[in-house]
Interface confidence: low
């Protein structure tokens, strides 16, 4: 039984108080167990050696369960995805008890927190997944999925985190509810990727020879691993791996009086291989001395008459096209001719007399090796 | 013709010294990175060190870095590798290496020079 | 370091056999590959480079492939002469040669 006391206070005429107290003895109306514990919440705990669950009752009081099933507030020794039923009571309740159904959860390791970034966006996305790598007979209707990743929470299996900071790191907790009881969670601190470095600043890009060409840069700011420097003349392309440490690089056995347009990107090898974007230049190497004419012929056209022809160079190296033709009797030069093209006609030389007949290119800097042939003019025949 | 000719091989004891060098010819050197790569008897090809054309990079492996230092002479045409506290394990055939591309395409080697350590 | 991983470490052949031998590095090397033949008692001679680039004066019977991680030397009719030693080089990042493929007469 429980007492409600009803009090009055008067104040007597000597100023004294006189109390008069009238009370009623009541029986008040203890909650019946099934209503106090109506709401009641359960959490379950994994037991990964025996692969069953402890259901711990989140009560204050220490409750009795039905056949002495609970101790300390907990139920041990459940099979995932089976039903128990326990009896809770109290003494600060009534009849008729608590009927609590348990249902068991699935084994927790029958889950898996999956990293599901694709590593080409990783630099900037998160994806986290929970996975179910074995079955369970329990109903995947009743399973839900929470995360929290900073102040943002999700009611998902899945998540993706986009727009983030690469090279970053990024904490995500969550959890997996049966019924809407917790029976696992998982925290994941994951580091976004390295990002795509920066654009390289080229200082100057240059030929000062024929064969050689130099390019000095400053590295991007972002992280990176080496460079790519690829140089195109015409169609042909060729790459290089730089090493991250270099600022400056030589060009060599570059082809004389050509443009070469250069591309110079840093990359990082990550998850994948992210290349950052491309500094871009070009120069001319300077002319070179031409290869040597080729295929020369030298031809009795009469007596005294020669045709001298010869194919142009392989190499020019250089911006014009003119050809020329020393003829030589002895050590003595007799003819110095220039052509556009590499046909002359040599007249009026002397019977019977060893020629020597030199032929070469000239780029216009530079004359090409010549070629050289020895032809003697005949009798003449009248 | 290009041609890479190695020399200053031998015997040394552990713990012992020698300087290799490679007198190259038919081709511009000073246009080139070269290296050397060893091959121990009965073994595989090993990378030991290479240098830039200029000389202003330098790269090694851990096993010889600190112990071998490659060097060149442009004037000389000539390539050295000196090696310093050799162990059992530096016994192999050296060869000097010419690299056609940057830092690949080894397409001129040495004959070798053959490198005994031993006690 | 990377590695590489040069697989068969021998094979038998026959003198017209397609022969394929390949290399795996442990990380990309984007291309940065070389392929090497020697035979007993000579230094070794450049067949490829940059994966698939023949050599000068290397027969057309040599071919290489590859990207990213994985790369493979085909010799398309194997001759006489080509019973030899095969390595691959990396050099991407610093140079790891492949562990060699000998090829023997079956």
């Known amino acids: 039984a429980y007492l409600n006391a009803s009090e009055t206070t008067t104040l007597s005429p000597s100023g004294s108080a006189v109390i008069s107290t009238t009370t009623i003895a009541t029986t008040p109306s203890k909650p019946t167990c099934d209503e106090k514990y109506a709401n009641i919440t359960v959490d379950y705990l994994y037991n990964k050696e025996t692969k069953l669950f402890t259901a711990k009752l989140n009560v204050n009081e220490n409750v009795e369960c039905g056949n002495n099933t609970c101790t300390n507030n907990e139920v041990h020794n459940l099979t995932e995805c089976k039903n128990a039923s326990v009896s809770i009571s109290h003494n600060s309740c009534t009849a008729p008890d608590k009927t609590l159904i348990l249902d068991v959860p699935p084994g927790v390791e029958k889950f898996q927190l999956h990293d599901c970034t694709q590593v080409e966006k990783a630099d900037t996305t998160i994806c986290l997944k929970w996975k179910n790598i074995e079955t369970f007979t329990c109903d995947t209707q009743n399973i839900t999925y929470r995360f929290q990743c900073g102040n943002m929470i999700f009611d998902n299996k899945e998540i993706k985190l986009e727009n983030l900071e690469p090279e970053h790191e990024y904490k995500c907790d969550s959890e997996i509810l049966y019924n809407n009881h917790k029976f696992t969670n998982a925290s994941k601190i994951i580091k976004t990727d390295f990002g795509s470095p920066g654009e390289p600043q080229i200082i100057f890009c240059r030929s000062e020879a024929a064969h050689q060409g130099v390019i000095t840069w400053n590295p991007p700011q972002r992280s990176f691993h080496n460079f790519t420097l690829c140089y195109i003349k015409e169609t042909e392309k060729d790459c290089l791996n730089l090493d991250k440490n270099l600022i400056k690089y030589d060009l060599q056995n570059l082809k004389p009086y050509t443009k070469y347009v250069l591309s110079l990107h840093a990359y990082i090898i990550a998850k994948v291989q992210r290349n950052g974007s491309a500094a871009m230049c070009h120069f001319t190497t300077k002319s070179a001395p031409p290869s040597q004419v080729w295929n020369m012929t030298v031809s009795m056209t009469s007596d005294n008459s020669m045709h001298v022809k010869c194919r142009p160079p392989r190499d020019r190296n250089g911006p014009h096209e003119r050809y020329h033709l020393e003829v030589e009797a002895g050590n003595t030069l007799v003819r110095n001719e220039s052509h556009k093209n590499c046909d002359f006609r040599v007249k009026d030389l002397q019977y019977s007399t060893d020629y020597t007949f030199k032929a070469y290119f000239h780029n216009g800097d530079y004359p090409g090796e010549p070629f050289i042939l020895h032809h003697s003019t005949s009798y003449n025949s009248k | 013709e290009v041609q890479l000719v190695e020399s200053g091989g031998g015997l040394v004891q552990p713990g012992g010294s020698l300087r290799l060098s490679c007198a190259a010819s038919g081709f511009t050197f000073t246009n080139f990175w070269m290296a050397w790569i060893r091959q121990a008897p009965g073994k595989g090809l090993e990378w030991v060190a290479s240098?830039?054309?200029?000389?202003?990079?330098?790269y090694y492996p851990d096993s010889v870095k600190d112990r071998f230092t490659i060097s060149r002479d442009n004037s000389k045409n000539t390539l050295y590798l000196q090696m310093n506290s050799l162990r059992a394990e530096d016994t192999a055939v050296y060869y000097c290496v010419k690299f056609h591309h940057y830092s690949g395409g080894g397409d001129a080697w040495g004959q070798g020079t053959l490198v005994t350590v031993s006690s | 370091d990377i590695q590489m991983t040069q697989s068969p470490s021998s094979l038998s052949a026959s003198v017209g056999d397609r022969v394929t031998i390949t290399c795996k590095a442990s990380?990309?090397?984007?291309?940065?590959l070389d392929w090497y033949q020697q035979k007993p008692g000579k230094a070794p001679k450049l067949l490829i480079h940059y994966t698939n680039n023949l050599h000068t004066g290397i027969p057309s019977r040599f071919s290489g492939s590859g990207s990213g991680t994985d790369y493979t030397l085909t010799i398309s009719s194997l001759q006489p002469e080509d019973f030899a030693t095969y390595y691959c080089?990396?050099?991407?990042?610093?140079?790891?040669f492949g562990g060699g493929t000998k090829v023997e007469i079956k």
């Open positions: 990380q990309n090397i984007n291309k940065y």
């Open positions: 080089l990396q050099h991407s990042s610093r140079w790891t």
């Open positions: 240098i830039s054309s200029s000389g202003g990079s330098i």
